[in-house]
């Protein structure tokens, strides 16, 4: 049941990326939709060895990843604002899940290059537009109605079954032989109770 709802959610959410609308827009596919979420790809040049990459939603820092090296060429990778992220030799991918309308916004990759010098900051970004398809909206509208109708049908079915059972039962009570048998059962029960009391 859970997986069914999840697939429905995936079906409903579709992502459209509008790049080139902002200054320093990414000249690559920045948003990759998969597994019920979005992978936001932040690229950096191959020569960059030490850096801080921040994912900004509007002006707010959502995630960050810092890669530095110590004096013995030992690598340190830190996150102050942790998100599920993936580091490669020329990109950092940040993953956002459980998408809804609130995720629609401008997203920026804010890259601070420490090494090689000089220190440099670059900003690239794009707009992540999340909308629901017409079919989704129709399904969203009809699904509760369908569920309600199903429940009503179930209840009516139960009532009908109960009514039919009662009808069948009452017809058997009106049968003369049936009535005689019923009376006998009651009398026997009464006798046994009296016997119990006497003892």
């Amino acid at each position: 049941m859970k997986s069914g709802l999840w697939y429905f959610f995936l079906f409903c959410l579709r992502i459209k990326v509008l790049t080139g609308e902002i200054n320093g827009s990414a000249n690559y596919e920045m948003f990759i939709f998969h597994n019920g979420g979005v992978q936001i790809l932040c690229k950096y040049p191959d020569i960059v060895q030490q850096f801080k990459m921040q994912l900004l939603k509007g002006g707010q820092i959502l995630c960050d990843l810092t890669k530095t090296k110590g004096s013995g060429n030992t690598v340190s990778i830190k996150s102050l604002k942790f998100c599920h992220s993936q580091l490669s030799n020329n990109s950092v991918s940040f993953f956002l899940y459980n998408l809804d309308h609130s995720h629609a916004n401008y997203y920026f990759c804010n890259l601070s290059i420490f090494d090689p010098p000089p220190f440099k900051v670059t900003l690239t970004g794009g707009y992540l537009h999340i909308y629901e398809s017409q079919l989704c909206c129709q399904l969203k509208f009809w699904l509760p109605i369908g569920c309600a109708a199903f429940v009503v049908v179930c209840i009516l079915g139960c009532i009908l079954i109960c009514w039919l059972t009662k009808k069948k039962y009452s017809s058997s009570v009106h049968d003369p032989n049936g009535e005689y048998m019923f009376m006998r059962a009651v009398n026997t029960a009464k006798k046994s109770r009296l016997t119990d009391v006497t003892l």
Epitope: Q49, G70, S71, G72, S76, K78, D115
Partner: antibody, heavy 117, light 111 residues
Framework: EVQLVESGGGLVKPGGSLTLSCAAS????????MDWVRQGPGKGLEWVGN????????YYAPFVKGRFTISRDNAKKTLYLQMNSVKSEDTATYYC??????????WGQGTLVTVSS | DIVMTQSPSSLAVSPGDKVTINCKSS??????????LAWYQQKTGQAPKLLIF???TRHTGVPDRFMGSGSGTDFSLTINSFQTEDLGDYYC?????????FGPGTKLEIK
């Protein structure tokens, strides 16, 4: 302006302990790896060890062999070097240094540690 | 551990001289496009100061008479026109691996 000021040096007996401190100012201390480098009297420079930005990882020179511990308090912007089981060959001026991504770009004035009975 | 050697161990110079200090590593310090080697100057009674990093890049505020060169295992520091304030000890240092090690130093003295 970046400033590193060491303190805590002095005379200590062999086998004894000493803690050196390094107060940092003029930069975001929690953004940098920090190192200790020492220099014996009339000798060259020798790397002691380092610590990463949040203090979770440390590396030491082979001669340390578990005797020294580097730690940091980012809230106090202070670097520490805890020296245990000191030997006469640990006599040196100890420098606190900032690893500026690709070299030791800032050094303290140094603090002298003398190990003698 | 990578062993760093320097030559000469000391050198007597006069103001205006071109001075060259050599540094050799026991293995290549080249990684990608970068040589993981730095040069430091230490004046008497003072802490060392960074001059050159990545074998040839001058640190901020370092006079342009100081030049670093070399690649792989052989490096040199050149002072194009030696001045009296350049007196002191010069150390090369690698940061290719742990532990980072320093050369034994070269002492520059007045002739």
């Amino acid at each position: 302006e970046v400033q590193l000021v060491e303190s805590g040096g002095g005379l200590v007996k062999p086998g004894g302990s000493l803690t050196l401190s390094c107060a940092a100012s003029g930069f975001t201390f929690s953004d940098y790896w920090m190192d200790w480098v020492r220099q014996g009297p009339g000798k060259g420079l020798e790397w002691v060890g380092n610590i990463d930005e949040d203090g979770s990882t440390t590396y030491y020179a082979p001669f340390v062999k578990g005797r020294f511990t580097i730690s940091r308090d980012n809230a106090k912007k202070t670097l520490y070097l805890q020296m245990n089981s000191v030997k006469s060959e640990d006599t040196a001026t100890y420098y606190c240094t900032r690893w500026g991504r690709y070299a030791f770009d800032s050094w303290g004035q140094g603090t002298l540690v003398t190990v003698s009975s | 551990d990578i062993v760093m050697t320097q030559s000469p161990s000391s050198l007597a110079v006069s103001p205006g001289d071109k001075v060259t200090i050599n540094c050799k590593s026991s293995q290549s310090l080249l990684s990608g496009n970068y040589n993981y080697l730095a040069w430091y100057q230490q004046k008497t009674g003072q802490a060392p100061k960074l001059l050159i990093f990545y074998a040839s890049t001058r640190h901020t505020g370092v006079p342009d008479r100081f030049m670093g060169s070399g690649s792989g295992t052989d490096f040199s520091l050149t002072i194009n026109s030696f001045q009296t304030e350049d007196l002191g000890d010069y150390y090369c240092q690698h940061h290719y691996s742990t532990p980072p090690t320093f050369g034994p130093g070269t002492k520059l003295e007045i002739k």
